[in-house]
Interface confidence: low
């Protein structure tokens, strides 16, 4: 399926729209808000009861080339005594983002949008108990 | 820009960096992943730092619907089911890339936009703010 033509029922296509070949779209990859500096609550990944580590994945044919992924450090959660409590579960929280993928076919280059699932951090949950019959 | 390895047999005119503007196929790869977090997991209810999910809709953006997490409590839920204020529920935030219609209302012309979303919440030991 194609990208949903969001709001086409009420959008009047302006005359100023650039001409685009069929089956494709024009994408400016100069990022809006590129320079916003954001830092979450200090050391959130190590202060959490479901702590996590970060790893950076690098792919030169992807834009952005760097994607940071989190991995939960424990199966259980850290209790007030600093010990792992396996009656609770550390689970990953994930979020989709878009990337641009560059594909080489011989000497020609094409670009493809791709959805990537990023693990952002972890949270501590009460486990779902599956009773075995 | 990003430097990429080049096929040595190709002409030198190929740019090693991503160009500023590209023509992109309208089909999105991996686009059928579940985008409604309420359906994809119930972590938001089972977490010791539970959160509510708020629908953020913008027809000038793709995806047009993004779910924002808001922590339900300042503290965390303890083993007795009560809120423990010795711990803090804090949102986990992530910068994501979306498409913004540019110029506005154009069906097939977009610009990448970086936005900050709260994805869920986690329970942390607080940083104590000492009052002078």
């Amino acid at each position: 399926r194609k990208i949903p033509k969001v709001g086409h029922t009420f959008f009047q296509k302006p005359e100023s729209c650039p001409p685009v070949p069929g089956g494709s779209m024009k994408l400016d990859i100069g990022i809006i808000n590129e320079n916003q500096r954001v830092s979450m609550s200090r050391n959130i990944e190590s202060r959490s009861t479901s702590p996590w580590n970060y790893t950076v994945t690098w792919d030169p044919n992807r834009y952005p080339s760097e994607v940071v992924q989190a991995q939960c450090r424990n199966l259980g959660c850290i209790n007030a005594q600093g010990k792992e409590d396996i009656s609770m579960n550390s689970v990953p929280i994930q979020q989709e983002t878009l990337v641009v993928r560059r594909k080489h076919q011989g000497c020609s280059v094409s670009f493809q949008l791709e959805k990537v699932l990023v693990t952002v951090g972890c949270t501590c949950v009460t486990p779902v108990i599956h009773h075995v019959q | 820009g990003i430097t990429i390895p080049r096929n040595p047999g190709c002409p030198n005119s190929e740019d090693k960096n991503f160009p500023r503007t590209v023509m992109v196929n309208l089909n999105i790869h991996n686009r059928n992943t579940n985008t409604n977090p309420k359906r994809s997991s119930d972590y938001y209810n089972r977490s010791t730092s539970p959160w509510n999910l708020h629908r953020n809709e913008d027809p000038e953006r793709y995806p047009s619907v993004i779910w924002e997490a808001k922590c339900r409590h300042l503290g965390c839920i303890n083993a007795d089911g009560n809120v423990d204020y010795h711990m803090n529920s804090v949102p986990i935030q992530q910068e994501i890339l979306v498409l913004r219609r540019e110029p506005p209302h154009c069906p097939n012309s977009f610009r990448l936009e970086k936005i900050l979303v709260s994805v869920g919440c986690t329970c942390v030991t607080p940083i104590v703010h000492h009052v002078a």
Partner: nanobody, 124 residues
Framework: EVQLVESGGGLVQPGGSQRLSCAAS????????MGWYRQAPGKQRELVAL???????DYADSVKGRFTISRDNSKNTVYLQMNSLRAEDTAVYYC??????????????????WGQGTLVTVSS
């Protein structure tokens, strides 16, 4: 740093009304949640009401229909209008907020902050 300063506490008759205010100051960028908690003598601190950045509010069952929380985003202030007060509403009322702020050039989001508390006594 961020400070929360409450005002409006005091002695009020049963059935009467009182309005509490809490102002957040500091280099604040955004306030995700502001609200009120209370602690009666010998009891645990409990939620009274919270108001989220989108304007939606949550209330404790014990105050629904009697208390109204509101906020003035331009002043970084939250209010608690308390009507039909009862003796069991006597407590120290604490303002609480989850705030994003700048400090030393870094943006910090969502640290929980508490005010010093203001005493509300409902008695004849």
């Amino acid at each position: 740093e961020v400070q929360l300063v409450e005002s409006g506490g005091g002695l009020v008759q049963p059935g009467g009304s009182q309005r509490l205010s809490c102002a957040a100051s500091g280099t604040i960028v955004n306030i995700h949640v502001m609200g009120w908690y209370r602690q009666a003598p010998g009891k645990q601190r409990e939620l009274v009401a919270l108001i989220f950045s989108g304007g939606s509010a949550d209330y404790a069952d014990s105050v629904k229909g009697r208390f109204t929380i509101s906020r003035d985003n331009s002043k970084n202030t939250v209010y608690l209008q308390m009507n039909s007060l009862r003796a069991e509403d006597t407590a120290v009322y604490y303002c609480a907020a989850e705030i994003g702020y700048y400090s030393g050039g870094t943006y910090y989001s969502s640290e929980a902050h508490w005010g010093q508390g203001t005493l509300v006594t409902v008695s004849s």
